[in-house]
């Protein structure tokens, strides 16, 4: 069942996801002037088991001016996952960033993809909020929203975040994207598909802070 609405918007804030629950679908969309290759996948699907999740299928775009000749190829999903955690990650990258059970990471960019990514979310998906540049965050609870199923209906919870117009002055270099806990929120066993776009709601960004007052920027 589809979540009825997009996650709530908060004034002067932006949100996205850092991990996608199994069952999430991502449409294979190409930017203007490009199209999916003939017989190319319509979507990517986050699948897996308790120990390993990855994106099935791949998205490939080719120039609309060509007819099934030169194609822009992206790695197979398995290659994408491996590349994301090894080869293309510099030595700087923290380890185990992709080890959230039952979740897939953000798929790496593919050539000539559309500006917006259209995801179809399942119940239990969380999105995480940050204040935009020039605003500071005040909250007494999690700056996140989760798609829940209650009495047969879906809804997004309201994030406890207020962004005030006070310019930020500090950097908080220790700020991290915490791992979202898939077990930390009650979920219905019913899968709930949600259609939303990357620029309208995004997936799971764990950026809540322990402190009740902290500063973030939107860039």
């Amino acid at each position: 069942e589809l979540c009825d609405d997009d996650p709530p918007e908060i004034p002067h804030a932006t949100f996205k996801a850092m991990a996608y629950k199994e069952g999430t679908m991502l449409n294979c969309e190409c930017k203007r002037g490009f199209r999916r290759i003939k017989s190319g996948s319509l979507y990517m699907l986050c699948t897996g088991n308790s120990s390993h999740s990855s994106w099935d299928n791949q998205c490939q775009c080719t120039s609309s001016a060509t007819r099934n000749t030169t194609k822009q190829v992206t790695p197979q999903p398995e290659e994408q996952k491996e590349r994301k955690t090894t080869e293309m990650q510099s030595p700087m990258q923290p380890v185990d960033q992709a080890s959230l059970p039952g979740h897939c990471r953000e798929p790496p960019p593919w050539e000539n993809e559309a500006t917006e990514r259209i995801y179809h979310f399942v119940v239990g998906q969380m999105v995480y909020y940050q204040c935009v540049q020039g605003y500071r965050a005040l909250h007494r609870g999690p700056a996140e929203s989760v798609c829940k199923m209650t009495h047969g209906k879906t809804r997004w919870t309201q994030p406890q975040l207020i962004c005030t117009g006070e310019m930020e002055t500090s950097q908080f270099p220790g700020e991290e994207k915490p791992q979202a806990s898939p077990e930390g929120r009650p979920e219905s066993e019913t899968s709930c598909l949600v259609t939303t776009t990357d620029f309208q709601i995004q997936t799971e960004m764990a950026a809540t802070m322990e402190t009740s007052i902290f500063t973030t920027e939107y860039q």
Epitope: K16, T115, C131, E175, K177, T216
Partner: nanobody, 130 residues
Framework: QLQLVESGGGLVQAGGSLRLSCAAS????????IGWFRQAPGKEREGVSY????????YYINSVKGRFTISSDNAKSTVYLQMNTLKPEDTAVYYC???????????????????????WGKGTQVTVSS
Amino acid sequence: QLQLVESGGGLVQAGGSLRLSCAASGLTFEGYAIGWFRQAPGKEREGVSYITGSDGTTYYINSVKGRFTISSDNAKSTVYLQMNTLKPEDTAVYYCAVDRLGSQGRYASAWWRSGDMDLWGKGTQVTVSS
């Protein structure tokens, strides 16, 4: 497959300048924040600067403000980091990276500072001698 390719690193004297380039052919810039991290030997990585492809918003860590300038040429799928008045402490391997924007095409610097990027380049060495 889509890759980030850095160039422009090298050896320069303190006070000198370098211009780094990051080529990302095929990347849809409008959907990403693109920029630079650096890591000096034995030190933590740090997010130096980024620019958003949606509206060109820029970010710099305090230590490079006024000295470094990030820019992009979307037509060439390239991001540049102009580094002026270089200091020995700027010596590091500089990595290009991209991260997906958030809702409404916006981005938060906390996401960049976390270092949890969607794609990385292989890096280019910058050495500033005193």
